[in-house]
Interface confidence: medium
């Protein structure tokens, strides 16, 4: 039993880091493998993560961590019984993938403006809380070409757009994701999408 693709890990910079890797053949990850991880710090204890299967030869492990700080560094040991298959280290602050925003809501009752709001996925005491910016994706269910991205570079988790920038009388979906420039993070996963029917009063045209 050997590691084919070494573990790569990302942290949500709050409480969970996720590591994925591939073995050289079909593996029952949860019964055959253990990923041990330990904060490189005096007197810190080692923790064990039981991996799950992620495809035939793929494994994934969700490492539970205390509040992360930028200096944290973890050693990782992947064991198959008494055999060490791989070892490495992981600095969560250098591999951040933010949590996905939640509670995306489209408010359609504000005159002819669409107001999209969502929740910041971090509590106020987390460093990322005040450092997230967002991308909002809006697309038409009827027309695949009607697909747009709005970059929200301010901290407020909301976006206002004129309803008239979208077609009237058809259904749209929206979703939102986040990233933090300060840690050069990857994008979060997209939030669950929300659907609404876009309708607005066409302006009266004078001839």
């Amino acid at each position: 039993m050997k590691v084919l693709q070494e573990p790569t890990c990302v942290s949500d910079y709050m409480s969970i880091s996720t590591c994925e890797w591939k073995m050289n053949g079909p593996t029952n990850c949860s019964t055959e493998l253990r990923l041990l991880y330990q904060l490189v710090f005096l007197l810190s204890e080692a923790h064990t993560c039981i991996p799950e299967n992620n495809g035939g030869a793929g494994c994934v492990c969700h490492l539970l961590m205390d509040d992360v700080v930028s200096a944290d560094n973890y050693t990782l040991d992947l064991w198959a019984g008494q055999q060490l298959l791989w070892k490495g280290s992981f600095k969560p602050s250098e591999h951040v993938k933010p949590r996905a925003p939640g509670n995306l809501t489209v408010h359609t009752n504000v005159s002819d403006t669409l107001l999209l709001t969502w929740s910041n996925p971090y509590p106020p005491d987390n460093y990322l809380y005040n450092h997230l910016t967002y991308a909002v994706n809006i697309w038409s269910e009827n027309d695949p070409a009607d697909f747009r991205i709005y970059n929200v570079t301010y901290l407020e988790p909301s976006l206002r757009i004129a309803a008239s920038t979208l077609k009237s009388g058809i259904s749209y979906r929206a979703r939102v994701r986040a990233w933090a420039q300060c840690y050069n993070t990857t994008w979060s996963e997209w939030s669950p999408s929300t659907k609404w029917h876009n309708s607005y009063r066409e302006p009266f045209e004078q001839h």
């Epitope: 050997k2 590691v3 070494e6 050289n24 490189v40 055999q83 060490l84 298959l85 791989w86 490495g88």
Partner: antibody, heavy 122, light 107 residues
């Protein structure tokens, strides 16, 4: 019995290239990471490079980075070290060394070859 | 890179003496350390692995201890065949690094 036999050493001029080989026998070659370690005349041991079981480089010493390339052929039970842009300070006895793990190991390197001598001189 | 500082660089001792060689790592390496013996004209031979485990076939007068950054190799009672050069090796992270070596000579 595990055996590691190095070859390919010799006298070469600065700036030229040389390719070292290591023939392994007595164990399942593709189950283990392998390394090259060198020793300059009258000096200590220096780890040069390592490679995992699946031909993935595990890194190089700063002194050889960008000049040396480690590789292996599991079908031939062979380890290689391609040495380019050789310098006089690369003069050394080069050992082929077996690891105890396939990628990284808890136990480190265990079996050594007898070495092949590389002399870089004009 | 992790630096391994080995001391002393040379040591004179007599048959039957107890000898201790030390290796210090520039950062914590857990117990990812081995000790190797090399005699002139020969390849190194591993004595100790995982900081304190005795390699099969190695006499029990050799022992290793330590974890983290401080490691020692002890020879409890020197024998004539023990006069050689000894090296520590960290295999915690790449690039692997050896100590500078300790030459053990007859007094």
């Amino acid at each position: 019995e595990i055996q590691l036999v190095e070859s390919g050493g010799g006298l070469v001029q600065p700036g030229r290239s040389l390719r070292l080989s290591c023939a392994a026998s007595g164990f399942t070659f593709d189950d283990y990471a392998m390394h090259w370690v060198r020793q300059a005349p009258g000096k200590g041991l220096e780890w040069v490079s390592g490679i995992n079981w699946n031909n993935g480089s595990l890194g190089y010493a700063d002194s050889v980075k960008g000049r040396f390339t480690i590789s292996r052929d599991n079908a031939k039970n062979s380890l290689y070290l391609q040495m380019n842009s050789l310098r006089t300070e690369d003069t050394a006895l080069y050992y082929c060394v077996k690891d105890t793990g396939s990628w990284a190991s808890y136990y480190g390197m265990d079996v050594w070859g007898h070495g092949t001598t590389v002399t870089v001189s004009s | 890179d992790i630096q391994m500082t080995q001391s002393p660089s040379s040591l004179s001792a007599s048959i039957g003496d107890r000898v201790t060689i030390t290796c210090r790592a520039s950062q914590g390496i857990r117990n990812d350390l081995g000790w190797y013996q090399q005699k002139p004209g020969k390849a190194p031979k591993r004595l100790i692995y995982a900081a304190s485990s005795l390699q099969s076939g190695v006499p029990s007068r050799f022992s290793g201890s330590g974890s983290g950054t401080e490691f020692t190799l002890t020879i409890s009672s020197l024998q004539p065949e023990d006069f050689a050069t000894y090296y520590c090796l960290q295999h915690n992270s790449y690039p692997y690094t050896f100590g500078q070596g300790t030459k053990l000579e007859i007094k």
